[in-house]
Amino acid sequence: LEETLLNTKLETADLKWVTFPQVDGQWEELSGLDEEQHSVRTYEVCDVQRAPGQAHWLRTGWVPRRGAVHVYATLRFTMLECLSLPRAGRSCKETFTVFYYESDADTATALTPAWMENPYIKVDTVAAEHLTRKRPGAEATGKVNVKTLRLGPLSKAGFYLAFQDQGACMALLSLHLFYKKCAQLTVNLTRFPETVPRELVVPVAGSCVVDAVPAPGPSPSLYCREDGQWAEQPVTGCSCAPGFEAAEGNTKCRACAQGTFKPLSGEGSCQPCPANSHSNTIGSAVCQCRVGYFRARTDPRGAPCTTPPSAPRSVVSRLNGSSLHLEWSAPLESGGREDLTYALRCRECRPGGSCAPCGGDLTFDPGPRDLVEPWVVVRGLRPDFTYTFEVTALNGVSSLATGPVPFEPVNVTTDREVPPAVSDIRVTRSSPSSLSLAWAVPRAPSGAVLDYEVKYHEKGAEGPSSVRFLKTSENRAELRGLKRGASYLVQVRARSEAGYGPFGQEHHSQTQLDESEGWREQLA
């Protein structure tokens, strides 16, 4: 990028540069018109018959350097060929010399600084590449010379440029004074300010563009070269903040549009809001969950929003004495999550009707909560109690929801307790055809024993037709019509209002071989 300090092509007033000495044959200002009929100014000199050692100086106005360390001067000039000048003597030249003088203010006068090299600093002696030929009465022909010179290093507030003619016939058509600077550059979301190079290469610190954040690591920098070009160097530096994506060739961060989001800083573009979420503003780093939907604390910010599951379905109970097996189907709606678990709540009601949460005597296998399979076994149920089990399905966002948790209930009433097994049977008397039996009255928890059932069969005769039953209301019984000297297996069970208890252990008894042995008491 070039920053102009002076361009005579753009000057609208007389330049009125200073000449020295005040003699004939000096530089003179002329004007012309460009294609748009705007005035353009030039300087001409043509003292080809000058006295030896006589120089014609032309000095520009004071030019503030505006921080430039090196300034470039592009000269456009034409130079008349000495051979085309009939009056040209040996002092005719086809070169001129360029100088500059630095000062902190516009202090030069018509006589100072002294018109000579030192204090003036010589830049170069300029020779014409193209010479203009002029024949009498004809128009001059020849190409314009363009020469760019480099001034510096400069340190004062400004400078003057001076041209010294020592016998040329030439026209200085235009002067462009400029310095080179690295233009403001935005690359990889990092902005590097416009920089005037003060050395061969200058490191320039970058700053993140609006809505970008620095990447970890060293802060981004780029090198501005003396020629006004940025040194090519990969720049990692900044990335768009959450809620913003890179745009316009990685030169700016654009806010995510409504309905999109970007959760992290860094590369990547805004994504549509995940399921069951929305963003009503631009620049969203996260999409808000719809009413009734949530993200668990452990869910990524970009995860869909989910909802608690519906209740489990079709709870099936199988009661087996004091044990209960419950089984159910998964809820219709999982809420959009994989982390489904089940939990049970339990209430028990006594026969009298008073109800309370289940006591600690119940055990749940594998447990009352955090169940991953849809079943549980409950043990330790008490007889003649009514149990209500509420089966709930839960997931990672159930704890975030307000309102009741849906459940599927199941009611189970346990049987009243039947009498225990009768096991201590003894034979009180035996004969060849009968056996008299007695047993202890079992302790029935739910009311008295109403009667007993005796089940017996001859040992070795196992078929259903060989089994015989006898009911008795006392805790004794006589089995008649038995075979002589045969072995019998006897079992007894008691009945209360709750029903029959289990048969006790088989008792082994034997009938007499003959009458002579008489009645004999036998103990089991």
Partner: antibody
Framework: QVQLVESGGGLVQPGGSLRLSCAAS????????MSWVRQAPGKGLEWVSA????????SYADSVKGRFTISRDNSKNTLYLQMNSLRAEDTAVYYC???????????????????WGQGTLVTVSS | DIELTQPPSVSVAPGQTARISCSGD??????VHWYQQKPGQAPVLVIY???KRPSGIPERFSGSNSGNTATLTISGTQAEDEADYYC???????????FGGGTKLTVL
């Protein structure tokens, strides 16, 4: 010798036309930027019109714009001023004048008039 | 556009210095030229580029220009210097020339 000689002046009625000529000699006319300057009786100098060396650029004072036309014939070393719709206030001595010339580049000229003709009187009256 | 203002007349005794002023806004930033016109004659350039003298013009004629005023100075004025003097400068485009109203120099 180097000189400019105007001709074509005279008496003309208001609304009438007149064409002034300026014959150049003694210098390379086709390298010179030329102008017309007038001077009303007892008054000061007033610039009227200008033309560049090749004749492609022209310029006029507001007082004559649209009525006067400057032109040149470099092959005849002559400058012209065609004056139409003349008014009484156009009565003046009309001078042709040469701008200071470049040494060799007719695209440019100095801003002063370094050569003047003797003038020609134009009288606009009924 | 610039307007150039001159005093209508200036009088000077022979041999004395005559100064004729020409004023205009920021005139010092423009080149000013001076013309001498004697009765019945065409104007003659006496000073150009503020202070330069064309060949054939006596050394007693000099010029300066700064600020808002340009000055034509005739030192050791002679009777033959009696004439009208006009300053001129160009306006915003180089082809438009403006003249001052003229100053009549009388040599007493």
């Amino acid at each position: 010798q180097v000189q400019l000689v105007e001709s074509g002046g005279g008496l003309v009625q208001p609304g009438g036309s007149l064409r002034l000529s300026c014959a150049a000699s003694g210098f390379t006319f086709n390298n010179a930027w030329m102008s017309w300057v007038r001077q009303a009786p007892g008054k000061g100098l007033e610039w009227v019109s200008a033309i560049n060396a090749k004749g492609q650029f022209t310029s006029y004072a507001d007082s004559v714009k649209g009525r006067f036309t400057i032109s040149r014939d470099n092959s005849k070393n002559t400058l012209y001023l065609q004056m139409n719709s003349l008014r009484a206030e156009d009565t003046a001595v009309y001078y042709c004048a040469r701008k200071g010339m470049s040494f060799y580049n007719n695209k440019y000229a100095k801003s002063m008039f370094d050569l003047w003709g003797q003038g020609t009187l134009v009288t606009v009256s009924s | 556009d610039i307007e150039l203002t001159q005093p209508p007349s200036v009088s000077v005794a022979p041999g004395q210095t005559a100064r004729i002023s020409c004023s205009g806004d920021n005139l010092g930033k423009k080149y000013v030229h001076w013309y001498q016109q004697k009765p019945g004659q065409a104007p003659v350039l006496v000073i150009y580029y503020d202070s330069k003298r064309p060949s054939g013009i006596p050394e007693r004629f000099s010029g300066s220009n700064s600020g808002n005023t340009a000055t034509l100075t005739i030192s050791g004025t002679q009777a033959e210097d009696e004439a009208d003097y006009y300053c001129s400068a160009w306006t915003t485009t180089m082809m438009h020339i403006v003249f001052g109203g003229g100053t009549k120099l009388t040599v007493l």
